[in-house]
């Protein structure tokens, strides 16, 4: 159920998960000069029951000054799938996710956490895209990507977002600013059934979100 690949990367855009599906893993990575405590968890895991989801395990880092090496934590064999790294530029300000059962909110930072977060997403995860600072959306179709299971393989849907330098775009007068459309890729372009995901609940949530939620940069 883990997604085999990373979400698509769009030039000059970042993506963000607003909530993490149960089964998502977050590697316990420490910043340079620190390491995981000896008996510490390798990763945090989003788990839950019908009414509540939360992150199991806690990440803990300790100084590695007493060691000769300060090497980064390497993923264990079960974590060797392609990973998505996310740079923590500022503290998270997650939106209220009480209306999204089966999902965990962004875990709070831990002491001496690495500058990147490495998530292992699961089927049904949705991420949202926006242009980085200094760029704007020339075109915005559905600006999200969902990890789906198709023919027994996982794949991410393609977000329809084109980012351009702010001085490079001509806009017709009187045109409204584009909004993300809730529809995914049309069925006519999909050759077989895909596993169902909580599309509706997530797109409803997306429709109420302001761009200020993108407080973490995903590179």
């Amino acid at each position: 159920e883990l997604c085999d690949d990373d979400p698509p990367e769009i030039p000059h855009a970042t993506f963000k998960a607003m909530a993490y599906k149960e089964g998502t893993m977050l590697n316990c990575e420490c910043k340079r000069g620190f390491r995981r405590i000896k008996s510490g968890s390798l990763y945090m895991l989003c788990t839950g029951n019908s009414s509540h989801s939360s992150w199991d395990n806690q990440c803990q880092c300790t100084s590695s000054a007493t060691r000769n090496t300060t090497k980064q934590v390497t993923p264990q064999p079960e974590e060797q799938k392609e990973r998505k790294t996310t740079e923590m530029q500022s503290p998270m300000q997650p939106v209220d996710q009480a209306s999204l059962p089966g999902h965990c909110r962004e875990p709070p930072p831990w002491e001496n956490e690495a500058t990147e977060r490495i998530y292992h997403f699961v089927v049904g995860q949705m991420v949202y895209y926006q242009c980085v600072q200094g760029y704007r959306a020339l075109h915005r179709g559905p600006a999200e990507s969902v990890c789906k299971m198709t023919h027994g393989k996982t794949r991410w849907t393609q977000p329809q977002l084109i980012c351009t330098g702010e001085m490079e775009t001509s806009q017709f007068p009187g045109e409204e600013k584009p909004q993300a459309s809730p529809e995914g890729r049309p069925e006519s372009e999909t050759s077989c059934l895909v596993t169902t995901t909580d599309f509706q609940i997530q797109t409803e949530m997306a429709a109420t979100m302001e761009t200020s939620i993108f407080t973490t940069e995903y590179q």
């Epitope: 769009i10 179709g141 393609q158």
Partner: antibody
């Protein structure tokens, strides 16, 4: 299935303008931006620009500013490109191509051959 | 503008042979590179995107690699239907720019 149907070949005199069309079908037209590409013997493939089918935003290759004008008509799911003040150097095949996520062109039109001759 | 230098401009290869075409960008393009195949009288067709991702339906004998400024397209075992012209495209920055093309013919 997804199709981009372009208008037919054009034989025009130097100095005039021509407008070629690209009609999208089999998908939600406004979800995907449209690119235009020129193919000539002299310069192989050249990217002309891209237009948002949703809001009309455009980005042009500087080389084609003043030469090409891209527009869209959402009601007919059609993208247009007008080429002005034509010269023999504009003789080429012009393609429209749909933008798709993190790679630019997943479907192409069949091409419109433009011949500028007196 | 980013200049894409593609080589060779033309080549002959035998059926079953391994073929490699290269593309060099004038600056780092962050792996935002596609490869296209074009056959006479037809529109180009995307083979590879993001430098090494194979488009659905493209035979697995095609592969892409590279990063930074240097990229390559490899056909592991040439088949007759592979003849045509191959182009690279950078889409890291506007304006998008194509390589000059490589004409691949069968010996």
């Amino acid at each position: 299935q997804v199709q981009l149907q372009q208008s037919g070949p054009e034989l025009v005199r130097p100095g005039v303008s021509v407008k070629i069309s690209c009609k999208g079908s089999g998908y939600t037209f406004t979800d995907y931006a449209m690119h235009w590409v020129k193919q000539s013997h002299a310069k192989s493939l050249e990217w002309i620009g891209v237009i948002s089918t949703y809001n009309g935003n455009t980005n042009y290759n500087q080389k084609f500013k003043g030469k090409a004008t891209m527009t869209v008509d959402k009601s007919s799911s059609t993208a247009y490109m007008e080429l002005a003040r034509l010269t023999s150097e504009d003789s080429a095949i012009y393609y429209c191509a749909r933008s798709y996520g993190n790679y630019p062109f997943d479907y192409w039109g069949q091409g419109t051959t433009l011949t500028v001759s007196s | 503008d980013i200049k894409m230098t593609q080589s060779p401009s033309s080549m002959y290869a035998s059926l079953g042979e391994r073929v490699t075409i290269t593309c060099k960008a004038s600056q780092d393009i962050n792996s935002y590179l596609s490869w296209f195949q074009q056959k006479p009288g037809k529109s180009p067709k995307t083979l590879i995107y993001r430098a090494n991702r194979l488009v659905d339906g493209v035979p697995s004998r095609f592969s892409g690699s590279g990063s930074g400024q240097d990229y390559s397209l490899t056909i592991s075992s040439l088949e007759y239907e592979d003849m045509g012209i191959y182009y690279c495209l950078q889409y890291d920055e506007f304006p998008y720019t194509f390589g000059g093309g490589t004409k691949l013919e069968i010996k």
